[in-house]
Amino acid sequence: DGCKDIFMKNEILSASQPFAFNCTFPPITSGEVSVTWYKNSSKIPVSKIIQSRIHQDETWILFLPMEWGDSGVYQCVIKGRDSCHRIHVNLTVFEKHWCDTSIGGLPNLSDEYKQILHLGKDDSLTCHLHFPKSCVLGPIKWYKDCNEIKGERFTVLETRLLVSNVSAEDRGNYACQAILTHSGKQYEVLNGITVSITERAGYGGSVPKIIYPKNHSIEVQLGTTLIVDCNVTDTKDNTNLRCWRVNNTLVDDYYDESKRIREGVETHVSFREHNLYTVNITFLEVKMEDYGLPFMCHAGVSTAYIILQLPAPDFRAY
């Protein structure tokens, strides 16, 4: 059929709750393309009728809710003027084990998500909720071991649960829950998170060293594509996260819709004493709004930025 297979994504999901997957693969999906979803190599596209339990919503496939029989491989076909690409998504649906309904009806949580809190620090957990904008998400509630979390040490901040002065007792099984409303119907979304505690000082016990960038500006022409590497050295056993942010937001979140600026896949080279990590940021097309804005590379507690600036005019041309 002339379509190029890009990659296979595996997702393990809970039955009886909503699920959505967005078909994006920059730079392919950043241009003028059409996106069509299919199930199990069927020639018939997934319905676009919003009343259908499974339907395509713009570039998303949306299950309202997921059911046992929905397991299988789904294909997303991305067609451009002169190209065709295909992403395969392997969905496996399982039944969650629930708490005794007499004590609140929350799940006996699996290790579906794993997150770490840092002992003695102020830290946070994230509720991963990925749905199209047609889905209105109600306030997020947080639970630990099936009991709703309350108390002075906890603050719900958007999709985060802030935890101040993390203690060993904070390890355990958490869940975040929200009511999703779509076309007047309500569904419960509930994600399980297994939380462990690390005793490392700071975020990982070492201060990572950012080799590049070095808090400097880069001259780049308007409209060009730009890729900048962030190179970081860190200890071999570190648990530090490395990422690019703009306006205090992960670039992939900040440019969630347009995908114009994306973080690359992290790679690393292992040396005897340390690891060298590289994570890039790609500007598919530099726009005026990018100039003068600090794009920050974060590695644990270390940060460094680049600022894009227009090249100085070449007066020799006049």
Epitope: K121, D122, S124, T155, L157, E158, S164, N247, N248, T303
Partner: antibody
């Protein structure tokens, strides 16, 4: 719970520097997020002034950039605003707030600063 | 700067009425749109973030929608405690900017 308390003089003379401090409890300002100043002149709308992030980098509204400095004292879990060369147009209620990935999620109760001789 | 234009600037409605406020951005803000409620003499409170997500403790009668440059905020059944000024705010591009506000009153 994350909470804020703004403090500073309620009256500042024209041409002087306005100085305010925001004391944060319930979360370390060096752990994450951006810590913001926002103002609201009496009977008017809201204007974002600037932020200092958890890593210490700052960003200011271009309309005020030449006059604004935001700094922090991590030992006291405080961040501060200095606005120089004030005029009557700077009379406003000044709020501090935490910005999550998307929004100004929690705010202090605000403090009124009047610029008058 | 991105200009945020809110309408109407004020409205008067009866308890139980459906109330809609609109917010238009001067350019596409990719759903980075938040709504706040401010009562006299108080700080603004976050109601909705990222176009369609309700903040902690916000009742379901507050209903958001929109995309691109146009966003709406609906109170399905106005309650006496909803009397306030409502602001939209874009978080897409620095400097972050607010709409001029919509004052909601009871008839």
């Amino acid at each position: 719970q994350v909470q804020f308390q703004e403090s500073g003089p309620g009256l500042v003379k024209p041409s002087q520097t306005l100085s305010l401090t925001c004391t944060v409890s319930g979360y370390s300002i060096t752990s994450d997020f951006a810590w913001n100043w926002i103002r609201q002149p009496p009977g008017k709308g809201l204007e974002w002034i600037g932020y200092i992030s958890y890593s210490g980098d700052t960003n200011y509204n271009p309309s005020l950039k030449s006059r604004v400095t935001i700094s922090r004292d991590t030992s006291k879990n405080q961040f501060s605003l200095k606005l120089s060369s004030v005029t009557a147009a700077d009379t406003a209620v000044y709020f501090c707030a935490i910005r999550g990935p998307y929004s100004f999620t929690y705010w202090g109760q605000g403090t009124l600063v009047t610029v008058s001789s | 700067d991105i200009q945020m234009t809110q309408s109407p600037s004020s409205l008067s409605a009866s308890v139980g009425d459906r109330v809609t406020i609109t917010c238009r951005a001067s350019q596409d803000i990719n759903n980075y749109l938040n709504w706040y409620q401010q009562k006299p003499g108080k700080a603004p409170k976050l109601l909705i973030y990222y176009t369609s997500r309700l903040h902690s403790g916000v009742p379901s009668r507050f209903s958001p929608s929109g995309s691109g440059t146009d966003y709406t905020f609906t109170i399905s059944s106005l309650q006496p405690e909803d009397i306030a000024t409502y602001y939209c705010q874009q978080g897409h591009t620095l400097p972050w900017t607010f709409g001029g506000g919509t004052k909601v009153e009871i008839k």
